[in-house]
Amino acid sequence: KLTIESTPFNVAEGKEVLLLVHNLPQHLFGYSWYKGERVDGNRQIIGYVIGTQQATPGPAYSGREIIYPNASLLIQNIIQNDTGFYTLHVIKSDLVNEEATGQFRVYPELPKPSISSNNSKPVEDKDAVAFTCEPETQDATYLWWVNNQSLPVSPRLQLSNGNRTLTLFNVTRNDTASYKCETQNPVSARRSDSVILNVLYGPDAPTISPLNTSYRSGENLNLSCHAASNPPAQYSWFVNGTFQQSTQELFIPNITVNNSGSYTCQAHNSDTGLNRTTVTTITVYAEPPKPFITSNNSNPVEDEDAVALTCEPEIQNTTYLWWVNNQSLPVSPRLQLSNDNRTLTLLSVTRNDVGPYECGIQNELSVDHSDPVILNVLYGPDDPTISPSYTYYRPGVNLSLSCHAASNPPAQYSWLIDGNIQQHTQELFISNITEKNSGLYTCQANNSASGHSRTTVKTITVSAELPKPSISSNNSKPVEDKDAVAFTCEPEAQNTTYLWWVNGQSLPVSPRLQLSNGNRTLTLFNVTRNDARAYVCGIQNSVSANRSDPVTLDVLYGPDTPIISPPDSSYLSGANLNLSCHSASNPSPQYSWRINGIPQQHTQVLFIAKITPNNNGTYACFVSNLATGRNNSIVKSITVSASGTSPGLSAGA
């Protein structure tokens, strides 16, 4: 089917368009182009007649059109009036007509836009500003850019008039930015030059610098005032209410005690008509005063609070020094000095931060020291400890237990036996105990300042007979040649002897075996697989003796270098290959095979039926122990010969 494609469809004025013909018939008498959607002789543009072999212009020919051999029509120097439909009329050799219509649209090349504003100097928090993108152009889209970004979403920004107008309500100083507008149509896009919005604001409350308010007699006083303001503020200084001068800086050389007083800076914005003032009190000392330390927290809590120690007074051009425990400050990430060294901050205080702290002011000749300050760091209570550590007592003796928990302020203690409150003392004394005094002894420590409590429970057994002991271990699965194991004989009992047996024998002499803690603890250093034995501990006193159940040490080891069996390496074709791999290991290792580097199966036995010379190669067994994290392997070469080629070959399994 004959069709027309316009390239481009949207054409800019002054540019060109090609009406491209698709599926032009083969045998032609001629073809002709017309303006509009139908064939109309009065609107013929140009035609080509095969008979004359000439192109003939028609009434609608403007001199800007070119017809091509493929019947396509080029229109140059496009004008607005060219918009619309174009019809190609094709007459075939058999005089049958065909028609096709195409169209394009013409748009102007947009001019560079500009921004007009209804208010060149809006006042912050008071005025609105309306920007309008000029000129108004038909069929154009308007866009806005702020600092080369698309418009932010804000209830104070409003687009209107087909997006041609951008209104900023209640302008703020943050609206001081570069504004651009852009016009777009299907053939062009143009951006305006930027317009900088000049928002009048302020003055804000002025700041007087430097911040220090204490000076020494004879120094120069140099105060500077600044207030955020547009246009820049005009400044005035007053001392004790009396006007001094209209400058941003106030300079008084060689000050005396008489210069002490209130210093006021007034900032004025002539455009907004607003005034703001700030007052600072200046103290001039005749002599440098003895420094003293102020703290922002007199009772800081450990691991919770920070403490800021400040050296007073603040004096200009002064060097501040600090000492802790009569030493210069240690390097610590928890110690921070301010820029002027006047403030020492202890981040997340600990009980070790109590001090004493001293600060100093350096004069020309000497250093003036403050009195020392000690921090009262509240901490604890830590877990209380009950002493002595014995848990077994004989009837008839006195039971004297003492409780202690690190705490500031000191902890208050309470004792409970089997959950029943006994007394509010640090020590618990029971004379001439009997079996009935056996039970759970709880010490509770309480810190009244922090409100925290901590408890420790101890089981006391009163018995003439020693109990059956048990063995506790610090490592249930030690790794060979790496770990140590400490066995402890429980319980701890008064006036008791502790003994040890290994595999029913008394302890062998070995540098790897060590007794400690009154023989209660047996330590094996650098365990080996040979240490995997039965360990028994015994306790005895003048009345009785008892032994624990044996504890067998489970030593993790291996895998050792594996062994592949049978050892044969030569096989006859047709035999079965049945290789078994074994490695000493605890726990048992995982096995895997590789033939010529290619992974096979994860089994201990590798079986291949009816092998051929194709099965020649290297057979590797890999072992891994997940518990020790260790691996090992071995490689075996297998040769398979054709049947009957060589004597002495294994027939296989």
Epitope: Q26, H27, L28, Y48, I50, G51, T52, Q53, Q54, A55, G63, I66, I67, Y68, P69
Partner: antibody, heavy 117, light 107 residues
């Protein structure tokens, strides 16, 4: 592809006749006129005329009326230029060129005719 | 007949330079003007048609301008292969006359 293939060079004596061929391929021969252009050695191009390949009607430039004749063999997509009663001044290269109303877009390689006694 | 006056007949220029050739028609021909390049021993090749339009495959350093009776042809930044002959031709009416040609020579 579209091409015009011309016959080979000719060496003739004065008074003889020469007929040059121009065979078209790659397009519909009868849709485009065929031009003939002459170029004497070291000289510029001269338009001799054209033949309407659809009707067979020739048009000659004034200078080439009389001894020069354009003809067609439409079935063979071939145009011919015949020069009768050759003169020494007919020594030139003769080009055929396909006509589109705005340009000559396809040219033959040229046939050199040398007239010498 | 429409006469086409092409100038200059020859011009010397250096590689990288620009050259302009002009063609004057003895009567108005609209924009029905073509420019051709001819290399020694070869047939002419179409460069520009309709006074300003570049033929397919022709480098953009070639350009044409003008309408009515005065036409220009420009080559910007001459390459070595551009030092050959150039012809204008009117196709407004028969006879389709050529200009006398311009031979570009390397300086």
């Amino acid at each position: 592809q579209i091409q015009l293939v011309q016959s080979g060079p000719e060496l003739k004596k004065p008074g003889e006749t020469v007929k040059i061929s121009c065979k078209a391929s790659g397009y519909t021969f009868t849709n485009y006129g065929m031009n003939w252009v002459n170029q004497a050695p070291g000289k510029g191009l001269k338009w001799m005329g054209w033949i309407n390949t659809n009707t067979g009607e020739p048009t000659y430039a004034e200078e080439f009326k009389g001894r020069f004749a354009f003809s067609l063999e439409t079935s063979a997509s071939t145009a011919y230029l015949q020069i009768n009663n050759l003169k020494n001044e007919d020594t030139a290269t003769y080009f055929c060129a396909r006509l589109w109303y705005l340009y000559f877009d396809v040219w033959g390689a040229g046939t050199t005719v040398t007239v010498s006694s | 007949d429409i006469q086409m006056t092409q100038s200059p007949a020859s011009q010397s220029a250096s590689l990288g330079e620009s050259v302009t050739i002009t063609c004057l028609a003895s009567q108005t021909i609209g924009t029905r003007l073509a420019w051709y390049q001819q290399k020694p021993g070869k047939s002419p090749q179409l460069l520009i048609y309709a006074a300003t339009r570049l033929a397919d495959g022709v480098p953009s350093r070639f350009s044409g301008s003008g309408s009515g009776t005065k036409f220009s042809f420009k080559i910007s930044s001459l390459q070595a292969e551009d030092f050959v002959s150039y012809y204008c031709q009117q196709l407004y009416s028969t006879p389709y006359t050529f200009g006398g040609g311009t031979k570009l020579e390397i300086k």
